[in-house]
Amino acid sequence: IWELKKDVYVVELDWYPDAPGEMVVLTCDTPEEDGITWTLDQSSEVLGSGKTLTIQVKEFGDAGQYTCHKGGEVLSHSLLLLHKKEDGIWSTDILKDQKEPKNKTFLRCEAKNYSGRFTCWWLTTISTDLTFSVKSSRGSSDPQGVTCGAATLSAERVRGDNKEYEYSVECQEDSACPAAEESLPIEVMVDAVHKLKYENYTSSFFIRDIIKPDPPKNLQLKPLKNSRQVEVSWEYPDTWSTPHSYFSLTFCVQVQGKSKREKKDRVFTDKTSATVICRKNASISVRAQDRYYSSSWSEWASVPCS
Amino acid sequence: RNLPVATPDPGMFPCLHHSQNLLRAVSNMLQKARQTLEFYPCTSEEIDHEDITKDKTSTVEACLPLELTKNESCLNSRETSFITNGSCLASRKTSFMMALCLSSIYEDLKMYQVEFKTMNAKLLMDPKRQIFLDQNMLAVIDELMQALNFNSETVPQKSSLEEPDFYKTKIKLCILLHAFRIRAVTIDRVMSYLNAS
């Protein structure tokens, strides 16, 4: 048993039929010694008396909020949560496996630049009785500080008949140098509690591997005289690291017809302009990627040819 | 994805082209190592990230762009020099700061070159003949070192008398390639910055 936060404890249980469970001793937080009784949740059934209560925790029926009372007055509470381990594997019932980039990916993280700021998100089909807390550090043996905000519900999506809820959190490395070469990964730990069930999820990554620039901005077309060609120009996104001559981007310019089946013309360039042929009803899209370290491409920025 | 090959203008900062070739060569070599050594721990997640230049050179700090010198987190490790202007020891007189940056890059290349050559000698003795270092990568390191135009003592190639442990050598190769790729990215950023200065 260990303390998750004040008055909230996690009991780790091997989960199999007829498992012996864990013996837990609860102590009433009071100077009183006599006349103390214990109850569980809203039930008025007295479970025991005395300053300590010993219970055998085997299943969810044994978890919940234990309260010690004296003469009708509440003295203290202890909330017991269960963390299930089946066949040596901790349960992952609360979050949805996003399966990208590989199976058993519950947390996904992205950074718009090298400032040490990043966003992580996760999915669940659970809508209520759900709390998350997020901690992060650089490295694990001698951890350096990363500060994370509160996890918030960032999107709701309908998937077939069911709703999916996306939660996200923003974190910032306390002292990040954008030019640094990372040798220790960022560790992100998410504690998830659904009713009386506790689970934890972790992700480990280098900022350089989760970079995804914002799309290029101010995408403009300038027709070239007496030609079907246009000059496409754009700018680095505002959120990208500076100086741009050090943190350079490379770009992909795509001309796409109305129909998805039409052949796409693609040009790669390190410049912030390109000359392409603009077909009728087509659109021109540009996306960006770190020029020197091939992490993710940005989303497309698009303009219609007309 | 292959980076587009830049054809440098004659007056262009001479090292940029070489640094781009270096990054391309090390990225290709790393990809080849990952594929060939698929049953070895060779991915970024699996390996220990070691830097053989640690405490010997200070490339990141010495080559820090002027704009980042206001960032205290970039200056915390040691007294830092930063690059201001200049070209790759071309005709103009290069500033002291600049020289420090470029000589640090040169020292990195020299250390990696020695490590890679030593390792290649071991890999050539492997009866499995599973993987060797790409001669192109070694050549590109050499070209960039020549373009940097520093004269420094040649480091003798390490020779080892004991029987090589080929498993450990291959894992060390992965560690080295990952670290060298990261350093090659930094070198490319620096050259790009200098080219724009």
Epitope: D41, Q42, E59, F60, A63, G64, D129, L196, K197 | -
Partner: antibody, heavy 117, light 107 residues
Framework: QVQLQQSGAELMKPGASVKISCKAT????????IEWVKQRPGHGLEWIGD????????NYNEKFKDKATFTADTSFNTAYMQLSSLTSEDSAVYYC??????????WGQGTTLTVSS | SIVMTQTPKFLLVSAGDRVTITCKAS??????VAWYQQKSGQSPKLLIY???NRYTGVPDRFTGSGYGTDFTFTISTVQPEDLAVYFC?????????FGSGTKLEIK
């Protein structure tokens, strides 16, 4: 002893609104969700939604989003459900119940609503 | 929303019989399933929570099992006082949904 006491039966005209109350005793009212459930003969039990009195946080079943409004008064340990624009479809028994971790563990006795012109 | 398909709708049994009711969720609800008993003219009463845990004071002839999508409620030896309608419910995610109910009648 936990108890939920609901307001009495109501006979309402179509188009009108009604407010059903649920007074809780015997536990910390602010810490437990109050659930509202509808039961019509032949339609089984339908969850309308819930309110956490301490924070005022609510969840509504999409189906009842424009029909029901939940409020709670922690000084009187009472939760309320207002049903608006009543039609004959709203004629049913409405229950309040408490929920923390173990399903709907305590139920009120039910309030019968009849909507008839 | 999650559909809880409860079978059978009716059960005609004799005292002492063993009774099994099943509930199938349209998607995984982990173990967040409760079973209720509703006697004629009364409010529902909680019998089982977290799929297999008996609520305080519930006789041990009532048991529940299951995980994910398939759940079972069993009365090992039916007593005359068990005449009632039994409902399953998922409280995994909102909207919380109930099964259609199983009416237990004693011969």
């Amino acid at each position: 002893q936990v108890q939920l006491q609901q307001s009495g039966a109501e006979l309402m005209k179509p188009g009108a609104s009604v407010k059903i109350s649920c007074k809780a005793t015997g536990y910390t009212f602010s810490s437990y969700w109050i659930e509202w459930v509808k039961q019509r003969p032949g339609h089984g039990l339908e969850w309308i939604g819930d309110i956490l009195p301490g924070s005022g946080s609510t969840n509504y079943n999409e189906k009842f989003k424009d029909k029901a409004t939940f409020t709670a008064d922690t000084s009187f340990n009472t939760a309320y459900m207002q049903l608006s624009s009543l039609t004959s479809e709203d004629s049913a028994v409405y229950y309040c119940a408490t929920r923390r971790f173990r399903g709907l563990d305590y139920w009120g006795q039910g309030t019968t609503l009849t909507v008839s012109s | 929303s999650i559909v809880m398909t409860q079978t059978p709708k009716f059960l005609l049994v004799s005292a002492g019989d063993r009774v099994t009711i099943t509930c199938k969720a349209s998607q995984s609800v982990s173990n967040d399933v409760a079973w209720y008993q509703q006697k004629s003219g009364q409010s529902p009463k909680l019998l089982i929570y977290y799929a297999s845990n008996r609520y305080t004071g519930v006789p041990d002839r009532f048991t529940g099992s299951g995980y994910g999508t398939d759940f079972t409620f069993t009365i090992s030896t039916v007593q005359p006082e068990d005449l009632a309608v039994y409902f399953c419910q998922q409280d995994y995610t909102s909207p919380f949904t109930f099964g259609s109910g199983t009416k237990l009648e004693i011969k």
